[in-house]
Interface confidence: low
């Protein structure tokens, strides 16, 4: 039989309304102020809270924390850190708080933190170290099994003087702590390219969301070991024809399901390996729906729908006839 | 030294009430939930109740629900076991036991209980 | 509820000798990190006493001769070399979900 609660399955210092107690462990301690906590169900929410930094009270049976829509702007080294550690939380989303530094250390002694969210935070400073913790070549591994970093560019003019897609990813590859990832998810941040080494050392990824960025080429970026990558979301970036080398790479990886729609395909002679491949391939969702956008007289002409005659490319002319 | 003292028992006639009380000291009774688990004669335990440590949330076993309430005080450090409506079967040893922070860890610490007998 | 059923229902064994108890759960009380299953012993006259959490945790205080093992449904308290201060009653109990339950008891004499 499910428990019987006399207060609400939410415990709240503000008024809140719950569904019912399900059936599940009682779960003691208090809930910090501005806070909604369910013992039964091990979640605690400070949602749109204006809170200026975490809780230092946060219950120790916390397996779900939500610390969204707040005004957090820096998470120091320990931001988690309890006595006796939070060792359940395993969920932790931070999205739409405005953090703009995320510093080493700052998950650390989280020994269950399987998901965290990051989205949604303009991060001008994301320290190499803050999923690993330490500045040692090779760190302990990091217990996270999905990552949620979609739209964290900071505005152009908060930015430090360095390229942001390096910043990240020297995030993701420090100390090789994040060899047990997942699901990576990177949509919405101007990424106008992919580092070469990223994905060779996340080796077990699932799930990668790389949608409504600004990638251009995918030429130097390898695939070949992901073996078990199962998505790959490519939609709406700048992506203009994929190589022989990414065709074969992406054929080869046995589970793979790509989703390219509104890249603004170019559709000359360089397209014309993409469009075989594409036209025996079964990798790639919704490939009826992909359409030239250049050149001029052939946008949004279907890139299944063409044939090698179509795809031509004007000549080069010499250099003394060029013009700008 | 974490004790747990509990007192209030005694002998009570069918239908009558009994408030039981634990009284706790060694350790911040805040920040800990507390339950009342009880034995009856010759028997093996069976758990009766639940308090947070804030008195957010209550928990009852289905044989003593609508009629027993288990309430706290902070500030007394003391538990409570409201008692209404009693029948024979309730009679029994009534332990108050501490749950930790971590609700993997069992009860930790528990008194040495008090005598409720329900007879006519 | 869930169920634990708890065997057997008494145990004589010689002293310095080993004793095992067994607890079986209706349903799993685990998850992929713990086991909420505890074991107490209860001396005559006295409360229970908490001896292991989380299926194979010794608490504090506890003698090193009482080990737990298992997960899911199936849990055992091992008593490796039987003392005379050791005869009691053992019971086993989960806090996977309300209400907790223990099992039955097993009374540990010296045979």
């Known amino acids: 039989s499910s428990p019987t609660s006399s207060a609400s399955s939410f415990s709240s210092s503000a008024p809140f309304l719950a569904s019912a107690v399900s059936a599940q462990p009682p779960l003691p301690d208090q809930c910090p102020a501005l806070c909604e906590c369910s013992e039964a169900a091990r979640t605690v929410k400070c949602v749109n809270r204006n809170l200026t930094e975490v809780p230092t009270d946060l219950p120790a049976y916390v397996r779900n924390l939500f610390l969204t829509g707040n005004q957090l702007a820096v998470l120091p080294a320990g931001a988690f850190a309890r006595r006796p550690p939070l060792a359940e939380l395993a969920a932790l989303n931070l999205s739409g708080s405005r953090l703009d530094e995320v510093r080493a250390g700052a998950f650390e002694h989280l020994p269950s933190l399987r998901q965290l969210d990051l989205s949604h935070n303009p991060l001008a400073d994301l320290s190499p170290f803050a999923f690993s913790g330490s500045n040692a070549s090779v760190s302990a591994p990091s217990p996270l099994v999905e990552l949620i970093l979609n739209h964290i560019v900071p505005p152009e003019d908060e930015r430090q003087n360095r390229s942001f897609e390096g910043m990240v990813v020297a995030a993701l590859l420090a100390g090789r702590a994040l060899q047990g990832l997942r699901r990576l998810e990177l949509a919405s941040n101007h990424f106008l390219y992919l580092p070469r080494d990223v994905l060779a050392q996340l080796p077990s990824l699932r799930h990668l969301d790389l949608s409504n960025n600004s990638l251009v080429s995918l030429t130097y970026v390898s695939f070949r070991n992901l073996t078990h990558l199962e998505s790959l979301h490519l939609e709406d970036n700048a992506l203009k024809v994929l190589h022989n080398g990414t065709l074969a790479e992406l054929q080869g990886l046995p589970h793979i399901r790509v989703f390219l729609d509104n890249n603004p395909w170019v559709c000359d002679c360089h397209m014309a390996d993409m469009v075989t491949w594409l036209k025996e391939t079964e990798v790639v969702q919704g490939k009826d729906r992909l359409t030239c956008a250049y050149p001029e007289k052939m946008r949004n002409r279907v890139l299944l729908e063409l044939n090698s005659a179509d795809l031509d490319c004007d000549p080069i002319l010499p250099p003394s006839l060029q013009t700008s | 030294e974490v004790q747990l003292v509990e007192s209030g028992g005694g002998v009570v006639q069918p239908g009558r009430s009994l408030r039981l009380s634990c009284a706790a000291s060694?350790?911040?009774?805040?920040?800990?939930?507390m339950h009342w688990v009880r034995q009856a004669p010759g028997k093996g335990l069976e758990w009766v109740a639940y308090?947070?440590?804030?008195?957010?949330?209550?928990y009852y076993a289905d044989s003593v629900k609508g009629r027993f309430t288990i309430s706290r005080d902070n500030s007394k450090n003391t538990l409570y076991l409201q008692m209404n409506s009693l029948r024979a079967e309730d009679t029994a040893v009534y332990y108050c036991?501490?749950?930790?922070?971590?609700?993997?860890?069992?009860?930790?610490?528990w008194g040495q209980g008090t005598t409720v007998t329900v007879s006519s | 509820d869930i169920v634990m059923t708890q065997s057997p229902d008494s145990l004589a064994v010689s002293l310095g000798e080993r004793a095992t108890i067994n607890c079986r759960a209706s349903?799993?009380?685990?998850?992929?990190?713990?086991?909420?299953m505890h074991w107490y012993q209860q001396k005559p006259g006295q409360p229970p006493k908490l001896l292991i959490y989380?299926?194979?945790n010794l608490e504090s205080g506890v003698p090193d001769r009482f080990s737990g093992s298992g997960s899911g449904t199936d849990f055992t308290l091992t008593i490796s070399s039987l003392q005379a201060e050791d005869v009691a009653v053992y019971y086993c109990?989960?806090?996977?979900?309300?209400?907790?339950?223990f099992g039955g008891g097993t009374k540990v004499e010296i045979k």
């Open positions: 060694g350790f911040t009774f805040s920040n800990f939930g």
């Open positions: 109990q989960h806090s996977w979900e309300i209400p907790y339950t």
């Open positions: 989380s299926s194979s």
């Open positions: 308090i947070s440590s804030g008195s957010s949330t209550f």
């Open positions: 036991a501490r749950s930790p922070a971590y609700y993997r860890y069992g009860l930790d610490y």
């Open positions: 349903q799993s009380v685990s998850s992929s990190t713990f086991s909420y």
